[in-house]
Amino acid sequence: LNTTILTPNGNEDATTDFFLTSMPTDSLSVSTLPLPEVQCFVFNVEYMNCTWNSSSEPQPTNLTLHYWYKNSDNDKVQKCSHYLFSEEITSGCQLQKKEIHLYQTFVVQLQDPREPRRQATQMLKLQNLVIPWAPENLTLRKLSESQLELNWNNRFLNHCLEHLVQYRTDWDHSWTEQSVDYRHKFSLPSVDGQKRYTFRVRSRFNPLCGSAQHWSEWSHPIHWGSNSSKENPFLFALEA
């Protein structure tokens, strides 16, 4: 039985194979039970976590994970060497940077060691599964009497990222947001000196080096206006 899994991470072509064994007419054998879906995320291209819901198993089972890269020099099957655990049951695998090849098709196989024919294989495009670290070192600069410029840094990925800036004043009920390309810089042309502004930024591995849908965590917010701007309009500290 071949089942295509539609995942929310840009890997719609992932295919999972479920293997059936012969079974009595009155009950399903354990090998017909679907295995949990594996979800992988590459964190800042430093390490990758592939996890599954271990509690979906009818009884606690230490599922095993193997992986390889399709049609490449790295197509040798590898065993997971660093399992993640949930209540002493395997629930994921962590791969280190040297084991990550973003632009090759990553094949991950989950297996029930007690029922070797009960296994599921998924193919993933890792360049669509990168989640960068949150932007850091937010700074504000006054360009003119009414214009502010927000700058920030990203660890390591730089031009591969796009960004989303959100800002609001203490008078606003919701955030205003603005997309920013790889230049990691944002200008607010019209600032009301009587209001206190809050800014925050998040980043995504898209569109130049990959097509990820998941954003980083939000940065720590930075504030401008009211008391802080009166004390020193050219020095703005990062506030957690």
Epitope: Y103, P207, C209
Partner: nanobody, 127 residues
Framework: QVQLQESGGGSVQAGGSLRLSCVAS????????MGWFRQAPGKEREGVAA??????YYADSVKGRFTISQDNAKNTLYLQMNSLKPEDTAMYYC??????????????????????WGQGTQVTVSS
């Protein structure tokens, strides 16, 4: 808007030479990877050569016969093909990446590394 336009393909006898060109607009050459790929009828697209960050890379089948180079002033990538063989017959494509040729693991010829592709130029080598 990045655009890649190949030229220089054609028909040639075995042992002959051709020089392919790829003009890039909206893309600045730097340490990012640019490559030549080819696809013969009924076969998968394969890497021929790539260049980036001062390094060049070649498929084993073309080493010593093909040379990849670039002219930054003209924003053009070249592929000089000498001692052509009938098995070199294919559509040749120019491709541009926004990462270095070996960045983030893998190989220079991983297709997914390249974000932009030209339309291709046909090379036919007859015996």
């Amino acid at each position: 808007q990045v655009q890649l336009q190949e030229s220089g393909g054609g028909s040639v006898q075995a042992g002959g030479s051709l020089r392919l060109s790829c003009v890039a607009s909206g893309y600045t050459f730097s340490s990012y990877c640019m490559g030549w790929f080819r696809q013969a009828p009924g076969k998968e697209r394969e890497g021929v050569a790539a260049l980036g960050g001062g390094s060049t890379y070649y498929a084993d089948s073309v080493k010593g016969r093909f040379t990849i180079s670039q002219d930054n002033a003209k924003n053009t990538l070249y592929l000089q093909m000498n001692s052509l063989k009938p098995e070199d017959t294919a559509m040749y494509y120019c491709a541009a990446a926004w990462v270095a040729c070996l960045e983030f693991g893998g190989s220079w010829y991983d297709l997914a590394r390249y974000k932009h592709w030209g339309q291709g130029t046909q090379v036919t080598v007859s015996s």
